[in-house]
Interface confidence: low
């Protein structure tokens, strides 16, 4: 159907309440103002239009909804709740829409939502119950299969002196609602660490992207439960070495492909196990591209070409022999 301009009024409970639902069902060929609609493709695109709210009059047929490049700022509870519900909405892209707050229950009443992209929004306030919709210890399972959260870290001054990693993980784990999640992308979020419990509670993951963060170590992270994991992206982090426990867990995953490019590998005596493992394993993609960053004498050496003799640690001098 051709795009038409239309708008709808709400009762006084709109736009920020879970109970806010359209007063009348939308007409079959209705298309919100500033959007393009294709009933044949079951797609609505409201892209780069500076929208400040989710349009109230979305057509009931929508399966793919693009709300990218807007100024939504806040996603309230029930932001997509409609009467009748948007029962077919399966893919929702909200990337780059200046969202900085996603409230509890923002995605409630979307029974078919499988793909959600919130990338490139400065999420200073992601409710722990954004995806689960309730504060119950065990929530109804979310239908989400793919959750894209790349570059959602807010500016430093908006982080409210709390752990951004912790905020994101709380939303991922609340109510165990995301047990069916298969793809999780968390690239470019300045993550310094990965909370140890997060992966254990996402057992269905096939694809995990943690690239372009600031991860220094995976020592306390367990991959053991991720038996379905097919790809693990750790490129462009601050990893210095992978220790035996991590290497063994990765090797034990039957379908895994690991990406480790562009990390500042420290090629000293602690690297010996990893080098041995790299020479034998087939799980690391592009392993021949991995090079040392430190110490200076080892810079740009290819890890696969190192011998145990190359990997030494400077002895720790007793205090009496140390010089300033």
């Amino acid at each position: 159907s051709s795009p038409t301009s239309s708008a709808s009024s709400f009762s006084s409970s709109a736009p920020f309440l879970a109970s806010a639902v359209s007063a009348q069902p939308p007409l079959p060929d209705q298309c919100p103002a500033l959007c393009e609609c294709s009933e044949a493709a079951r797609t609505v695109k409201c892209v780069n239009r500076n929208l400040t709210e989710v349009p109230t009059d979305l057509p009931a047929y929508v399966r793919n909804l693009f709300l990218t490049g807007n100024q939504l700022a806040v996603l309230p509870a029930g932001a997509f709740a409609r009467r009748p519900p948007l029962a077919e909405l399966a893919a929702l892209n909200l990337s780059g829409s200046r969202l900085d707050e996603v409230r509890a229950g923002a995605f409630e009443h979307l029974p078919s939502l499988r793909q959600l992209d919130l990338s490139h929004n400065p999420l200073a306030d992601l409710s722990p119950f954004a995806f689960s919709g309730s504060n119950a210890s065990v929530s109804a399972p979310s239908p989400l299969v793919e959750l894209i959260l790349n570059h959602i870290v807010p500016p430093e001054d908006e982080r409210q002196n709390r752990s951004f990693e912790g905020m994101v993980v709380a939303a991922l784990l609340a109510g165990r609602a995301l047990q069916g999640l298969r793809r999780l992308e968390l690239a470019s979020n300045h993550f310094l660490y990965l909370p140890r419990d997060v992966l254990a509670q996402l057992p269905s993951l096939r694809h995990l992207d943690l690239s372009n963060n600031s991860l220094v170590s995976l020592t306390y992270v367990s991959f053991r439960n991720l038996t379905h994991l097919e790809s693990l992206h750790l490129e462009d982090n601050a990893l210095k070495v992978l220790h035996n426990g991590t290497l063994a867990e990765l090797q034990g995953l039957p379908h895994i492909r690991v990406f480790l490019d562009n990390n500042p590998w420290v090629c000293d005596c602690h690297m010996a196990d990893m080098v041995t493992w790299l020479k034998e394993t087939e799980v690391v993609q592009g392993k021949d591209r991995l090079t040392c960053a430190y110490p200076e004498k080892m810079r740009n050496r290819v890890l696969l070409e190192l011998n145990s003799a190359d990997l030494d640690c400077d002895p720790i001098l007793p205090p009496s022999l140390q010089t300033s």
Epitope: F10, S12, F16, Q71, S127
Partner: antibody, heavy 120, light 111 residues
């Protein structure tokens, strides 16, 4: 300099209609949601209506729902309030106000107001 | 609708003294990060002027003797040292949801 200038007020009999305008300048009008707020003589402020930047969404106070219509013409940088079936209790100064993209920033610019008097 | 209750209705304060106005919302208007509460000043014959947004942020150009605090349901506007030009009616307002609602106003006068 941001400026909002209301016009269209006047004296009107109950049951009649009036259309208010708010001319905006000094900012990119099409990027901002806009509100109408009114103030009855000697009383406080009452929010009336809101329209989003691209007219995709609008909301009304219960007291005016079904009688008032908010609209905008981004090509003319103008906000409107069509007021039908006017009542004595609609007598007030009507202000237009700008709403930044982030709701937590409040209504940051207001017009001087235009007076509507509904009287027989 | 969220009801905003302001107190006191009027306030007489000596020049240079502190003035404090309270506002209570009938439900929380704060998320874990932001408060959707604002304060306005209105002088006779003029439109309201935004003083404080998000509970505690001073709008550009507003003197720093004005300050705001609070979260959840209870908020306060403070004028640390009242000046003659501060005589006005002050309103609180939330933007948590539609409809936005205002407090009834507090008239500040010089004692």
């Amino acid at each position: 300099e941001v400026q909002l200038v209301e016009s269209g007020g006047g004296v009107v009999q109950p049951g009649r209609s009036l259309r208010l305008s708010c001319a905006a300048s000094g900012f990119t009008f099409s990027n901002f949601g806009m509100h109408w707020v009114r103030q009855a003589p000697g009383k406080g402020l009452e929010w009336v209506a809101y329209i989003s930047s691209g007219s995709s969404t609008f909301y009304y106070a219960d007291s005016v729902k079904g009688r008032f219509t908010i609209s905008r013409d981004n090509s003319k940088n103008t906000l409107y309030l069509q007021m039908n079936s006017l009542r004595a209790e609609d007598t007030a100064v009507y202000f237009c106000a700008r709403s930044p993209a982030y709701y937590r920033y409040g209504l940051d610019y207001w017009g001087q107001g235009t007076t509507v008097t509904v009287s027989s | 609708d969220i009801v905003m209750t302001q107190s006191p209705d009027s306030l007489a304060v000596s020049l240079g003294e502190r003035a404090t106005i309270n506002c209570r919302a009938s439900q929380s208007v704060s998320s874990s990060t932001f408060s959707y509460m604002h304060w306005y000043q209105q002088k006779p014959g003029q439109p309201p002027k935004l003083l404080i947004y998000s509970s505690s942020n001073l709008e550009s150009g507003v003197p720093d003797r004005f300050s705001g605090s609070g979260s959840g349901t209870d908020f306060t506007l403070t004028i640390s040292s009242l000046q003659a030009e501060d005589v006005a009616v002050y309103y609180c307002q939330h933007s948590w949801e539609i409809p936005y609602t205002f407090g009834g106003g507090t008239k500040v006068e010089i004692k």
